[in-house]
């Protein structure tokens, strides 16, 4: 008799999930000598232990604590780049500006980036058919709780000037419901963080508006100021030129506004 299986609204676990996590861990620890003490088998076991045999709508931050402990990593606290709805450009930037870090440049972020996973209550199986959707099913699902946990810890570690890249092409440039808006903003530590500097990335080539005056940016400024953190904002009118100038800052065209 086939066992009844819960049908969730979201896509199932990414195929070859265990192998992918193990492979990413090995690759990361190869590339980052400071993380070579990490035992990737233990990392996988802790990752698996966070969600296997548990109801995928009843996952807690506590479930991920063994994994958090194993993945503890020190990044320069004044070199943190947050992002919202503009991940690819943020990652392109840190690939060039190697002394700055997004969450996905850390071991735990790198392991889970773009992956989906969930298990089933009381079975050791991974569910490759479907996983809970944050809106349609439940917010305390394995993927959402993971990102909430690592994002909180990442924001808590930040100091001095923290940068955030925001997508100026979206209707809500700052979205209170994004991970940045709901988790990271509220976990920056005012006693450590002096300034949050927003980089608003323009989409259209002819777009010369000052998007730092956008109502949602003003809302972000208000939230940050109330937390006793200074706020600044820059328009990045030409993201392609911006990246080019990060690569080649001596270029004569890089003295003008980008």
């Amino acid at each position: 008799v086939p066992r009844w299986r819960q049908q969730w609204s979201g896509p199932g676990t990414t195929k070859r999930f265990p192998e992918t996590v193990l492979a990413r861990c090995v690759k990361y620890t190869e590339i980052h000598p400071e993380m070579r003490h990490v035992d990737c088998q233990s990392v996988w076991d802790a990752f698996k232990g966070a969600f296997i045999s548990k109801h995928p709508c009843n996952i807690t931050e506590e479930d991920y604590q063994p994994l958090m402990k194993l993945g503890t990593q020190t990044v320069p606290c004044n070199k943190i780049l947050l992002w919202s709805r503009i991940k690819d450009l943020a990652h392109q930037f840190t690939q060039v500006q190697r002394d700055m870090f997004t969450l996905e440049d850390t071991l735990l972020g790198y392991l889970a980036d773009d992956l989906t996973w969930c298990g089933e209550f009381n079975t050791s199986k991974i569910n490759y058919q479907s996983c809970p959707d944050w809106r349609k099913d439940c917010s305390n699902n394995p993927v959402s709780v993971f990102w909430k946990t690592v994002s909180r810890r990442f924001a808590e570690a930040a100091c001095d000037v923290v940068h955030v890249m925001l997508n100026g092409s979206r209707s809500k440039i700052f979205d209170k419901n994004s991970t940045f808006g709901s988790v990271e903003v509220h976990n920056l530590q005012p006693e450590k963080v002096q300034t949050l500097e927003a980089w608003v990335i323009h989409g259209g080539r002819e777009d010369s508006r000052d998007l730092c005056q956008d109502p949602t940016i003003k809302e972000l400024e208000s939230i940050i100021s109330k937390r006793n953190i200074q706020f600044s904002c820059k328009n990045i009118y030409r993201p392609d030129k911006f990246l080019q100038c990060v690569k080649n800052p001596e270029d004569s065209s890089c003295t003008s506004e980008i």
């Epitope: 265990p18 035992d39 990737c40 088998q41 233990s42």
Partner: nanobody
Framework: EVQLLESGGGLVQPGGSLRLSCAAS????????MSWVRQAPGMGPEWVSG????????YYADSVKGRFTISRDNSKNTVYLEMNSLRAEDTAVYYC???????????????RGQGTLVTVSS
Amino acid sequence: EVQLLESGGGLVQPGGSLRLSCAASGFIFSVYAMSWVRQAPGMGPEWVSGVSGSGINTYYADSVKGRFTISRDNSKNTVYLEMNSLRAEDTAVYYCASGKGWDGNTWYEDYRGQGTLVTVSS
């Protein structure tokens, strides 16, 4: 270039012991899980044992549990298989393999050596 060189095989009587070694080069040894796989004449390969990168996690096939011990020395880039209470059915070519690790069902292997022959016979 990844190289895995097994040694220590030979002829041994039932109930006897052997210690296999595998010297690895061409990769960052300490981040890779290592395993031993064997292939008896006319049979398919059988995973025997595995050890995680740091050596903290070890795994064994039921057929060798309690008789074989896997270990590694990351300072020497070497993995070992201590084999005790050997039986005729342990006769096989023993291969050393590097890989990603064990997910509870599958051992993910990347490279395999040339093997060393173990013969258990009186």
